[in-house]
């Protein structure tokens, strides 16, 4: 399986919210003895690899994120936690995966990693991540509202508030 | 950089209990496991147990679980074994590791330097 | 539980010569879904703690010295150091983390 990223840089103006998507697709096991987490976490910029430092989202952690099922059953946190901590993340049924942040501050911006772990007879673990830029900005240069830029081409696109 | 220090050798009688430490620094200690080692005099490495410091969820070894207990200290980044019960064969060097697995087993990429614990009457 | 062997116990090997360490599994290790082994490689020196050498059988961690390489697949391991150092004369583990965790009884390498 693999997991693409829609936008590779997600710019927005202080206090607004934003959702960070990822996909998650290609063949999948759905026998009784595998379970998938799809899950998120923040890193950083200048390492040998993408997404090898892990680092919490507003003092959570990847499992306080996670959603888990098998195969591409839809499924959300509705975990007090995270949305005490303006986050929120869910699924559907299309791969689709994400985390909404609410009233984005400065504090926000950095390298942001969405996941997704296989895990046979509750043991053995293959991951696969997608890796993205959130940068929030303040003042006069701020945009009105959040913009994607995909991450295959240098077109922009508007995404509204979640 | 990325460390593990653990605290100092211990002397205990047989049937006490013993609390090693493990202080974190240098990497996000909540996102990743602890887990515990030990090896016997000139014997090999046995795990013991691992524990989540973001959750406090610890997982066992069958042969530890009745006597080992894991613990964390968010605040001071540190995370402690308890092993009750001490008994002549428990003499050993007992290692805190980390490894980088986020639901599954991983290999272990940072060591403590180790704490010896030396059970004896 | 998946048991690991190593053998021999105890190997003589004089400096600049090559060293071949070997490990077994009771089981396979290959985890099908990303066709990876999971095992690794781990160095000892007497009073230090055990320092990853190699992961996924074959991948050197950062830093240390392409005179280590790892091989094999499934059930049986290789660690080969191609030209043996002065610092290299130490004990070696494998360990394996498809289900749980085990590491076998070691290889102590000692200078003939």
């Known amino acids: 399986f693999k997991v693409a990223t829609l936008y590779s840089l997600y710019v927005c103006p202080e206090g607004q919210n934003v959702t960070l998507t990822c996909r998650f697709f290609g063949p999948v096991d759905k026998g009784h003895d595998v379970t998938f987490y799809k899950t998120w976490y923040r890193s950083s910029r200048g390492e040998v690899q993408t997404c090898s430092e892990r680092r919490p989202i507003r003092n959570l952690t990847f499992q306080d994120l996670h959603l888990h099922h098998g195969g591409h059953q839809a499924a959300n946190t509705s975990h007090d936690l995270a949305q005490r901590h303006g986050l929120e993340s869910a699924s559907d049924h299309h791969g689709n995966f994400s985390i909404t942040m609410r009233n984005l501050t400065l504090l926000d911006s950095g390298l942001y990693c969405c996941l997704v772990v296989e895990i046979r007879h509750h043991h053995s673990e293959h991951r696969v991540h997608g890796a993205m830029e959130l940068q929030v900005q303040t003042g006069k240069d701020a945009p009105s509202s959040c913009v994607a830029y995909p991450s295959s081409s240098q077109e922009s696109e508007n995404i509204t508030a979640a | 950089q990325v460390q593990l220090v653990q605290s100092g050798a211990e002397v205990k009688k047989p049937g006490a209990s013993v609390k090693v430490s493990c202080k974190a620094s240098?990497?996000?200690?909540?996102?990743?496991?602890i887990n515990w080692v030990r090896q016997r005099p000139g014997q090999g490495l046995e795990w013991i147990a691992r524990?989540?410091?973001?959750?406090?969820?610890?997982y066992y070894n069958e042969k530890f679980k009745d006597r080992a207990t894991l613990t964390v200290d968010k605040s001071t980044s540190t995370a402690y074994m308890e092993l009750s019960s001490l008994r002549s064969e428990d003499t050993a060097v007992y290692f805190c590791?980390?490894?980088?697995?986020?639901?599954?087993?991983?290999?272990?990429?940072?060591w403590g330097q180790g704490t010896t614990v030396t059970v004896s009457s | 539980n998946i048991m690991m062997t190593q053998s021999p116990a105890t190997l003589s090997v004089s400096p600049g010569e090559r060293a071949t360490l070997s490990c077994k599994s009771s089981?396979?290790?290959?985890?099908?879904?990303?066709?990876?082994?999971?095992l690794a490689w781990y160095q000892q020196k007497p009073g230090q703690a055990p320092r990853l050498l190699i992961y996924?059988?074959?991948t050197r961690e950062s830093g240390v010295p392409d005179r280590f390489s790892g091989s094999g697949s499934g059930t049986e391991f290789t660690l080969t150091i191609s030209s043996l150092q002065s610092e290299d004369f130490a004990v070696y583990y494998c360990?394996?983390?498809?289900?749980?965790?085990?590491f076998g009884g070691g290889t102590k390498v000692e200078i003939k």
């Open positions: 360990h394996q983390y498809l289900s749980s965790y085990t």
């Open positions: 089981q396979s290790v290959l985890y099908s879904s990303n066709q990876k082994n999971y």
């Open positions: 240098g990497y996000s200690f909540t996102d990743y496991y």
């Open positions: 524990i989540f410091p973001g959750s406090g969820n610890a």
């Open positions: 996924w059988a074959s």
């Open positions: 590791a980390r490894d980088d697995s986020f639901y599954g087993y991983w290999y272990f990429d940072v």
